[in-house]
C-alpha cells in the first residue's frame, strides 16, 4: 500500500523520494508521474531527471532537495484538491527490471 502524505489547499506539498548514488557517482535517471507506477516508465510525467540534470518539468513541480546527491523529493506548489491522488517516483536503475518504484498518496484537505 502507498505511504500517505497530506497538504492543505494553497500550500506546497512535499513527496519524499531518495536513492543512493552508485559508486561511480553517476546520477540515476528518475521520473515522477501522476498515477501509480506502471510496469515501465512513469505515466503522466510531471518531472524527469537524467544522468546530468533535471531535463523536464512542468509548472508547479520542482525539486527542492539536492537531486545530484540522490534527493529527488518532489515539491508541488500551491496545491488544489485536483492534486490529490497517487504519485509515482521511479528510480530508473540500468538493467532489466532493476527500477525502484515508490507510490505515494497525496491527500489534500
Amino acid at each position: 500500500s502507498e505511504v500517505e502524505y497530506r497538504a492543505e489547499v494553497g500550500q506546497n506539498a512535499y513527496l519524499p523520494c531518495f536513492y543512493t548514488l552508485p559508486t561511480s557517482g553517476t546520477l540515476v535517471p528518475v521520473c515522477w508521474g501522476k498515477g501509480a507506477c506502471p510496469v515501465f516508465e512513469c505515466g503522466n510525467v510531471v518531472l524527469r531527471t537524467d544522468e546530468r540534470d533535471v531535463n523536464y518539468w512542468t509548472s508547479r513541480y520542482w525539486l527542492n532537495g539536492d537531486f545530484r546527491k540522490g534527493d529527488v523529493s518532489l515539491t508541488i506548489e500551491n496545491v488544489t484538491l485536483a492534486d490529490s491522488g497517487i504519485y509515482c517516483c521511479r528510480i530508473q536503475i540500468p538493467g532489466i527490471m532493476n527500477d525502484e518504484k515508490f507510490n505515494l498518496k497525496l491527500v489534500i484537505k
Epitope: 540534470d53 533535471v54 527542492n64 539536492d66 537531486f67 500551491n78
Partner: antibody
C-alpha cells in the same frame, strides 16, 4: 527561439524610481525563475536575487534588500526590477537571466541584453 | 557568502595556445560550479555547468574540470573570437556568487 528582451537605457536623478522590464518568449514563462544580475561599470557580475514566476515569491540577496523589488506580469511573460530612491552607486547594467526553479539548479542559461541605468544629478 | 577567486586577472595569449583559467571557492561547493563568457558589450553566455558538463552550441574547445574548491576552465586552441571576460559562479549556496573574472586577450 528563446529570448529575453529588456527595456531601453535609463537616465535618472538621485532619489527617483526606475522600473526595468524583461519580456520572455520561446518557452513557458512560469516553468523557470527569473534572476536579476547587476554589473557596475568595469566591474564583475553580482546576483541581486530571483523571483519564482509561478508564485511570484521573490528572493533577495542581502545587499539588495530594501530599495529593490522584483515583480511579474505573467500574462505578458514579463518580469520587472524596480529600484526606489536611486543612488549614484546604482549606476550599472542590469541583466535578467533565466533560472530553473529547482533549488540546486542555479546556472543561468539565457540572458537579456542588459539595461543600462545611469544615475546622475 | 562563498567567495570565488579567479586567477589570473588578465591572460594574454596567442591564437592556437591551450590556456587554463583558475577559479577557487572559499569553501567546498562539490561540483556546483558554472562558467560564463562575456564578450565586450554583450551579455554573459553559459559555457560549462556543474564544473565539467558541456552546453549545447558551445565549441568543444571549451572544457572544465575540478571539484570541491578548485576548478579550471580550459580552452584547447584559443581563437581570436574567444577574447572577453570569463566568470566562474558558485551554484551551491545562495547568493550564488561570481568570481571577479579573468580577462582573456589576444597578443
Amino acid at each position: 527561439q528563446i529570448q529575453l528582451v529588456q527595456s531601453g537605457p535609463e537616465l535618472k536623478k538621485p532619489g527617483e524610481t526606475v522600473k526595468i522590464s524583461c519580456k520572455a518568449s520561446g518557452y513557458t514563462f512560469t516553468t523557470y525563475g527569473m534572476s536579476w544580475v547587476k554589473q557596475a561599470p568595469g566591474k564583475g557580475l553580482k546576483l541581486m536575487g530571483w523571483i519564482n514566476t509561478y508564485s511570484g515569491a521573490p528572493t533577495y540577496a542581502d545587499d539588495f534588500k530594501g530599495r529593490f523589488a522584483f515583480s511579474l506580469e505573467t500574462s505578458a511573460s514579463a518580469a520587472y526590477l524596480q529600484i526606489n530612491n536611486l543612488k549614484n552607486e546604482d549606476t550599472a547594467t542590469y541583466f535578467c537571466a533565466r533560472k530553473p526553479p529547482h533549488y540546486y539548479v542555479n546556472s543561468f542559461d539565457y540572458w537579456g541584453q542588459g539595461t543600462t541605468l545611469t544615475v546622475s544629478s | 557568502d562563498i567567495v570565488m577567486t579567479q586567477s589570473p586577472a588578465t591572460l594574454s595569449v596567442t591564437p592556437g595556445d591551450r590556456v587554463s583559467l583558475s577559479c577557487r571557492a572559499s569553501q567546498s561547493i562539490s561540483d556546483y560550479l558554472h562558467w560564463y563568457q562575456q564578450k565586450s558589450h554583450e551579455s554573459p553566455r553559459l559555457l560549462i555547468k556543474y564544473a565539467s558538463q558541456s552546453i549545447s552550441g558551445i565549441p568543444s574547445r571549451f572544457s572544465g574540470s575540478g571539484s570541491g574548491s578548485d576548478f579550471t576552465l580550459s580552452i584547447n586552441s584559443v581563437e581570436p573570437e574567444d577574447v572577453g571576460v570569463y566568470y566562474c559562479q558558485n551554484g551551491h549556496s545562495f547568493p550564488y556568487t561570481f568570481g571577479g573574472g579573468t580577462k582573456l586577450e589576444i597578443k
